[in-house]
Amino acid sequence: PEPPTACREKQYLINSQCCSLCQPGQKLVSDCTEFTETECLPCGESEFLDTWNRETHCHQHKYCDPNLGLRVQQKGTSETDTICTCEEGWHCTSEACESCVLHRSCSPGFGVKQIATGVSDTICEPCPVGFFSNVSSAFEKCHPWTSCETKDLVVQQAGTNKTDVVCGPQDRLRA
């Protein structure tokens, strides 16, 4: 008879035998035989394996290098890798978060549409008519122009996307 060519999902084929895979968090020490089960051992400190596997070595946990602006968001276990994120004011340069860059600031004339997170940069938008931003900031939104009318004043200088309107007193009519 032909030896097996396939095995069930939690098994692997070796020496014409279907052996049990090692559970997540454990590595393979020795393959099964007709009379002995697969031998597995837990991963060591700072190591992990996140799938049913036949790996003879566990993977090292990711190192969150503070020199690259990284810090630990979630500590790794024997079954999961460490998750890194960036220090305050910085964000990851990639999905794998291997290094960080400073959040960009929105220049005058632009306001913050979306504040940056540990994984995404600041999103800026141009200040529309009626709004302005006169600072370079990673937090400030566009501010509405001052309403001179509500203060019983008149516009002396029109606002721009970078400057607020300048209000002044209404001219008194001379008798």
Epitope: R8, K10, E34
Partner: antibody, heavy 127, light 107 residues
Framework: EVQLLESGGGLVRPGGSLRLSCAAS????????MNWVRQAPGKGLEWVSY????????DYADSVKGRFTVSRDNSKNLLYLQMNSLRAEDTAVYYC????????????????????WGQGTMVTVSS | DIQLTQSPSSLTASVGDRVTITCRSS??????LAWYQQKPGKPPKLLIY???SLEGGVPSRFSGSGSGTDFTLTISSLQPEDFATYYC?????????FGQGTKLEIK
Amino acid sequence: EVQLLESGGGLVRPGGSLRLSCAASGFTFGSYEMNWVRQAPGKGLEWVSYISSSGETTDYADSVKGRFTVSRDNSKNLLYLQMNSLRAEDTAVYYCARDVFFFDSSGDNGAYGMDVWGQGTMVTVSS
Amino acid sequence: DIQLTQSPSSLTASVGDRVTITCRSSQGIRSSLAWYQQKPGKPPKLLIYGASSLEGGVPSRFSGSGSGTDFTLTISSLQPEDFATYYCQQLNSFPSTFGQGTKLEIK
């Protein structure tokens, strides 16, 4: 309630074809490996075929290899057995059965078993 | 292919008896063995998996033991509902195979 329901059985001439279906309900069908097992009248159980949860791995008993094809549609929770070139000795009740992997994380290896079975569908091959 | 041989093929016993059914494999299968109970006109029912683990909801009078090539199913005290046919199955490798069955009849 976890359930499997076979359909598609019937009387067919030798050399003919038949497609059996097995409708699954009450569990996440796409996460489980599945099997077809048959039982000829008054006889014992005979494993027929296996399919992995994704459908990419299949296996068959020597007695049906090259004639039967197992497949699945996870979006419809359906398991199929396409039976071609049928013979008199294929006459049996056909059961679909769910493979389950029993695992206790404190234990070493875990084990398989077929924990849910359909009621079966009768296939008669006769001229 | 792995052959499973059950003995005895049939067995007559009384309510309250202790009954043992054996299953021998043609090659070592470690503990990749399951036991099923089947009543006439019904599908099989899983009793034991991994040679010795009891499936949920199965009465504790059923027990399994063995590893390698020799396995046993024991019913410690037969109840009227236990009269049925019992099958062993190896899930070690494909093709998966069943024993020929043991018919347990009432004396």
